[in-house]
């Protein structure tokens, strides 16, 4: 069977402070079953940005309906960007379990924040 791929097509995205940023992510397969989470940064210090299953992420919205059957697009939009949002964002696939097990990460998309033009 073909290995699951987590595809983040853009290596980098640049937005002005105050604007919204779209971070794209698709998966190559619906199998295995399990959630996608977004993180800023890698390793133990990474910051959870979006988890559809639980939590409240008011500045983040899913671009496609993640609850829709056969959805393979897990892109997100972050609103009202500030300089503290700069960093590399990873789309990460988990296998459903107790707890969920991390399977594969995308290559990452670096978000840079420009000063808002005056």
């Amino acid at each position: 069977e073909e290995e699951l791929q987590v595809i983040q097509p853009e290596k980098s995205v640049s937005v002005a402070a105050g604007d919204s940023a779209t971070l794209n992510c698709t998966v190559s397969s619906l199998i295995p079953v399990g959630p996608i989470q977004w993180f800023r940064g890698a390793g133990p210090g990474r910051e959870l940005i979006y988890n559809l299953k639980e939590g409240h992420f008011p500045r983040v919205t899913a671009v496609s309906d993640p609850t829709k059957r056969n959805n393979m697009d897990f892109s997100i939009r972050i609103s009202n960007i500030t300089p503290a949002d700069a960093g590399t964002y990873y789309c990460v696939k988990f296998r459903k379990g107790s707890p969920d097990v991390e399977l594969k990460s995308g290559a990452g998309t670096e978000l840079s924040v420009r000063a808002k033009p005056s």
Partner: antibody, heavy 119, light 108 residues
Amino acid sequence: DVQLVESGGGVVRPGESLRLSCAASGFSFRSYAMNWVRQAPGEGLEWVSRINSGGGGTDYADSVKGRFTISRDNSKNTLYLQMNSLRAEDTAVYYCAKQYDWNSFFDYWGLGALVTVSS
Amino acid sequence: ETVLTQSPATLSVSPGERATLSCRASQTVGSKLAWHQQKPGQAPRLLIYDASNRATGIPDRFSGSGSGTDFTLTISSPQTEDSAVYYCQQYYYWPPYRFGGGTKVEIK
């Protein structure tokens, strides 16, 4: 309802240690960054430390760096602040505060725990 | 580091008389500014976030405005229970998170 309840405050001598705890309920604790903020008697609010949702990322105010350690146990819904080498100027009410999202303001505060450092 | 300066240090108003509190940032913080209220002997409570949005359960006599470096908290018709210290907090640049020095509001 979101509830944050601090404990572990007390009176210690300079150079001694103390560990504060903050028990959280009413929200998905493991999804949120948490902070400690302190307030010296008659003074304003001073941010002390922040820990990210997973517990692997921490930040500290310069005034406590190297002496204080923030940690969390997501299985127990509890936030901690280990305070070592305490000084008189650490005397304050210590509040735990929840962040609205990872890069945001503090939307809920605990009732506070009083720490007094005195010889 | 962004410094927040609040003025006046103390504001004394009569019930029903508009109260205007100022918070000035040393550099732009966009709209990333919150206001917290702290009554004597109590923990702080979030009033306003993103400069102008009222937090859940906050009466509409409280309003926030401003962006960039200059922000205002207005209490349109203060009640006696509004006697408190009010702090602004920026979350545009961090760490560290910064609070203003506070404005004490006294209702005569």
